[in-house]
Amino acid sequence: ECVTQLLKDTCFEGGDITTVFTPSAKYCQVVCTYHPRCLLFTFTAESPSEDPTRWFTCVLKDSVTETLPRVNRTAAISGYSFKQCSHQISACNKDIYVDLDMKGINYNSSVAKSAQECQERCTDDVHCHFFTYATRQFPSLEHRNICLLKHTQTGTPTRITKLDKVVSGFSLKSCALSNLACIRDIFPNTVFADSNIDSVMAPDAFVCGRICTHHPGCLFFTFFSQEWPKESQRNLCLLKTSESGLPSTRIKKSKALSGFSLQSCRHSIPVFCHSSFYHDTDFLGEELDIVAAKSHEACQKLCTNAVRCQFFTYTPAQASCNEGKGKCYLKLSSNGSPTKILHGRGGISGYTLRLCKMDNECTTKIKPRIVGGTASVRGEWPWQVTLHTTSPTQRHLCGGSIIGNQWILTAAHCFYGVESPKILRVYSGILNQSEIKEDTSFFGVQEIIIHDQYKMAESGYDIALLKLETTVNYTDSQRPICLPSKGDRNVIYTDCWVTGWGYRKLRDKIQNTLQKAKIPLVTNEECQKRYRGHKITHKMICAGYREGGKDACKGDSGGPLSCKHNEVWHLVGITSWGEGCAQRERPGVYTNVVEYVDWILEKTQAV
């Protein structure tokens, strides 16, 4: 069961896996959650009754019964991992720890104006896990305003000590705030010849890349496929690093694949969730249980529901044996990966889906698109919402997109004349406007946050957030869309769609069924030529056909320009303005969302 509260002055006895150092019990719980085996932990807080060498220790524990005996101990704080919980989990830690020096390998020292600048520097440095910053009040003159960037093998400090007038904190890479490039390509027939920091077994290069992404020291990887000539290295995933952060040598080798950590795009790509099945593949590991199951899907469900299960192998039933049920082998290992992978034995293997909640909900695959036609089908654009105003009478006002369980992203110009959020209603999971009746459930709006530089749509900053009064429970028909990664600024999106209930031509009415149109992006240079009287800034993005004919129009405002990239949908634009609708050589102009990621995160993650 899910236990979120911390147990003060309590110590769990036994079950130790490893000890790490964390600045708080809260962060110890996060570390436990992300550790492949940890189910419980005991943290020792700073206390006069405790030996200072034990302060800030976070002992990660495991137990077959999922619990351990409790002992009273002053300054000890214990708790359970969030693995047992169904809620969304994030490793993002924005806390700043005052008067704590988090020890690690100090590899960079520079002057910074503030702790925030130091944290930003850490976030944008490929090696940095955490930092310590000496404030202006630090006794040593030469160290004042010094920002020390640090890394360790585990990503957590090797020790934490009290030091007056310093502050420490973690990289915000896991908060989606890094400006580092996001290189998603996997390079076939390539070996990166740099130092290995670890090696694990993986069924394919994609799983290897995901493991690299959440390994604290891994910057890039090489995977040897099952056709690799050296048998002992087949399915081997080598996790690598280098001083420069890039591979120093690439060697052409058949049957090997290489790629990069997706650390700086992990909020818009699944990195924990290995959802595929691997046929004719057996995963070896420590056996947890053997259960009868009807199918490999059922076996995966059993593994997902068993908190200690990390991966499984299903052997289908032989003919009419055992009521058609096969054997489901639930397994685990010290690092969450199989200890060996065998092929040709007829098994079907896969991983627990328990870790999927550590990925952003927006990365979940949605129904396949309906090709052709202009009317959408239910669940095709589950992030699309219709924003209604109730004054003077109820009507569709604008589109919007779900980007979090309490947040809608839309256009600022939608709120011209809107005096209060009380008159707004957000409807999600809607296909036809006619579905909206008196008793249709909606989300009230608690707050309208308009970008403070917004004046009018044509001059940019046409972006607004709606904070909902209640949270959205994600389902197939209502779920978030990923924000683009800052590291993805150079991505060329080729599969972009605009959706909305807006007019189909300039003089028209709101449509009943949600409309969709595939529209190509237009370069800003090209767009500027079409709008000589306006300034098309880098904070805008344009889309449209040269000949016109397909475009967003009145009523689509605030809705998404959604682009699919690497199987994940990204909110690339917000419908903003244009000259007429679908006119020849007049592309639609959209708010370029990637340029506002910091603003969105600042507003939505504010304490």
Epitope: F138, S140, L141, E142
Partner: antibody, heavy 124, light 107 residues
Framework: QVQLVQSGAEVKKPGASVKVSCKAS????????MHWVRQAPGQGLEWMGI????????SYAQKFQGRVTMTRDTSTSTVYMELSSLRSEDTAVYYC?????????????????WGQGTTVTVSS | EIVMTQSPATLSVSPGERATLSCRAS??????LAWYQQKPGQAPRLLIY???TRATGIPARFSGSGSGTEFTLTISSLQSEDFAVYYC?????????FGGGTKVEIK
């Protein structure tokens, strides 16, 4: 062993510039700050400024602001101090001295390694 | 800037005797103070930092004390090699400043 080796003595005319070098060895050059201190004949020590060899950031004493420039070359582990618009009162022995270890935070330190000094004579 | 004043300017002591040198700061420098020894024709040598911590290789006869504005360097039993000029220096604020020095000579 850790040492700082400075360039040789210089004789300059008033109004000219002088550039003194200080080559570090035996330690990680970019991990420590470097100070420049001068001593006029028969006088005490006078601090001129500091350079952080890692990023190249500098801080100068007000008295020398606008006349002194401290630079570094990480490839040769050398720091330079250039003093322009020389006058006779700039006649002194110029020392480079290693300062704080910047890769670790601690409260107290001193200038623990000094160069042998470079005599600069300004005379018409 | 912080003005460092050393006294006396000259101290005449016999070998084997105790020498006490003073350094006063015009405002508090906490414990951010160092002491140096300089012999004729040589570069200064760090003796004490943090007001009281001996630098590597410095004999135990050298000790430092004080904090805030008043500091003392004590040489418990003067050896012949200790006759030199001693400078204090504050590390509390820019610009760094040195005292005028105390010359310790043989009595």
């Amino acid at each position: 062993q850790v040492q700082l080796v400075q360039s040789g003595a210089e004789v300059k005319k008033p109004g000219a510039s002088v550039k003194v070098s200080c080559k570090a060895s035996g330690y990680t050059f970019t991990s420590y700050s470097m100070h420049w201190v001068r001593q006029a004949p028969g006088q005490g020590l006078e601090w001129m400024g500091i350079i952080n060899p890692s990023g190249g950031s500098t801080s100068y004493a007000q008295k020398f602001q606008g006349r002194v420039t401290m630079t570094r070359d990480t490839s040769t582990s050398t720091v330079y101090m250039e003093l322009s618009s020389l006058r006779s009162e700039d006649t002194a022995v110029y020392y480079c001295a290693r300062g704080a270890y910047l890769m670790e935070l601690y409260y107290y330190y001193g200038m623990d390694v000094w160069g042998q000094g470079t005599t600069v004579t300004v005379s018409s | 800037e912080i003005v460092m004043t050393q006294s006396p300017a000259t101290l005449s002591v016999s070998p084997g005797e105790r020498a006490t040198l003073s350094c006063r700061a015009s405002q508090s420098v906490s414990s951010n103070l160092a002491w140096y020894q300089q012999k004729p024709g040589q570069a200064p040598r760090l003796l004490i930092y943090g007001a009281s911590t001996r630098a590597t290789g410095i004999p135990a006869r050298f000790s430092g004390s004080g904090s805030g504005t008043e500091f003392t360097l004590t040489i418990s039993s003067l050896q012949s090699e200790d006759f030199a000029v001693y400078y204090c220096q504050q590390f509390n604020d820019w610009p760094l400043t040195f005292g005028g020095g105390t010359k310790v000579e043989i009595k």
